[in-house]
């Protein structure tokens, strides 16, 4: 586990779990139900879900200087997606396929967020908006877009942890 006061997390463990997350996110995506691509709309990105951006300190230099900024951002994102995957968007009808990896994905998000959360120390969780109720007709598109955003998020997180494991591990 990461330790309060800015010490390093268990980079190798984080790397392994984030790689597992990548695999799960990609395998979950086609299984959320048939999605007509015309339903996607034009917007490629949305403010409804977290993204890792340039100013978040997740570049090699930023990680070297102070990895806590980036790790906090990743932690916030993991908590956000964990909340989304546990909401009625994914748990309500139309039901997911019985073999859907969304349950595993949900558990792995929680696992990685706990690995990053220092004992006895709580990062400020940037306002995670309360989720509005969704109706079944909305859910296929919501699932599709959330998982697509999650894929991008965990891909960046995995690169961060791979870099950390290779260059920042004690």
């Amino acid at each position: 586990r990461a330790v309060p006061g800015g010490s390093s997390p268990a980079w190798t463990q984080c790397q392994q779990l984030s790689q597992k997350l990548c695999t799960l996110a990609w395998s979950a995506h086609p299984l959320v139900g048939h999605m007509d691509l015309r339903e996607e709309g034009d917007e490629e990105t949305t403010n409804d879900v977290p993204h890792i951006q340039c100013g978040d300190g997740c570049d090699p230099q930023g990680l070297r200087d102070n990895s806590q900024f980036c790790l906090q951002r990743i932690h916030q994102g993991l908590i956000f997606y964990e909340k989304l995957l546990g909401s009625d968007i994914f748990t309500g009808e139309p039901s997911l396929l019985p073999d859907s990896p969304v349950g595993q994905l949900h558990a792995s998000l929680l696992g990685l967020s706990q690995l990053l959360q220092p004992e006895g120390h709580h990062w400020e969780t940037q306002q995670i908006p309360s989720l509005s109720p969704s109706q079944p007709w909305q859910r296929l598109l919501l699932r599709f877009k959330i998982l697509r955003s999650l894929q991008a998020f965990v891909a960046v997180a995995a690169r961060v942890f791979a870099h950390g494991a290779a260059t920042l591990s004690p």
Epitope: E43, D48, S130, P136, W137, Q138
Partner: antibody, heavy 117, light 107 residues
Framework: EVQLLESGGGLVQPGGSLRLSCAAS????????MTWVRQAPGKGLEWVSG????????WYADSVKGRFTISRDNSKNTLYLQMNSLRAEDTAVYYC??????????WGQGTMVTVSS | DIQMTQSPSSLSASVGDRVTITCRAS??????LHWYQQKPGKAPNLLIF???NLHSGVPSRFSGSRSGTDFTLTISSLQPEDFATYFC?????????FGHGTRLEIK
């Protein structure tokens, strides 16, 4: 009192544009998805478009896809429908409605859009 | 798209009558069927949601039920204010679709 109030309807020529607004009051607008439903004169109800609470996710009926754009400004408690390339068959009363937990639970009074040359 | 077939399209009845309106979905929609009432020149109002639940303020003479993909709206004893048009709607899949309506008139 929970209320939705549409505005912006009127007479427009085929191919023209119009922007409808729906002002919400009496509830936490940013916590709800919203939708537009229309009703042609003497006809039934037709769902047009929907938008998720914070605006990043949108849905459209095939009949309006590529021509209409739904948006919202949560700071102003207002829902919008930008309608381009209007056709005679878009003539209808347009209602905004709140997407409740189960159904469209609150409706505005409607605004009439007439597309005619 | 899921088609909602509503019947009858119009109905004449008297105050005090028991009236039933039916709606059939072209495929399974679970219990995601709702009923709205609309009076001339006014917006629709939600009456019943999720098959059988009365929206707030709706009198108990209104009720809803389901058998498979067939849904029924029943008014146990018609009152003068109940003469209106009634629509069913499914919220199970995109796009949400409505029945064509049942116009309830005074006999």
């Amino acid at each position: 009192e929970v209320q939705l109030l549409e505005s912006g309807g009127g007479l427009v020529q085929p191919g023209g544009s119009l922007r409808l607004s729906c002002a919400a009051s009496g509830f936490t607008f940013s916590a709800y998805s919203m939708t537009w439903v229309r009703q042609a004169p003497g006809k039934g109800l037709e769902w047009v478009s929907g938008i998720y609470s914070s605006g990043g996710f949108t849905w459209y009926a095939d009949s309006v896809k590529g021509r209409f754009t739904i948006s919202r400004d949560n700071s102003k408690n207002t829902l919008y429908l930008q309608m381009n390339s209007l056709r005679a068959e878009d003539t209808a009363v347009y209602y905004c409605a709140r997407v409740g937990l189960w159904a469209f639970d609150i409706w505005g009074q409607g605004t009439m859009v007439t597309v005619s040359s | 798209d899921i088609q909602m077939t509503q019947s009858p399209s119009s109905l004449s009845a008297s105050v005090g009558d028991r009236v039933t309106i039916t709606c059939r979905a072209s495929q399974s929609i679970s219990g995601y069927l709702h009923w709205y009432q609309q009076k001339p020149g006014k917006a629709p109002n939600l009456l019943i949601f999720a098959t059988s639940n009365l929206h707030s303020g709706v009198p108990s003479r209104f009720s809803g039920s389901r058998s498979g993909t067939d849904f029924t709206l029943t008014i146990s004893s018609l009152q003068p204010e109940d003469f209106a048009t009634y629509f069913c709607q499914q919220s199970f899949s995109t796009p949400p679709t409505f029945g064509h309506g049942t116009r309830l008139e005074i006999k």
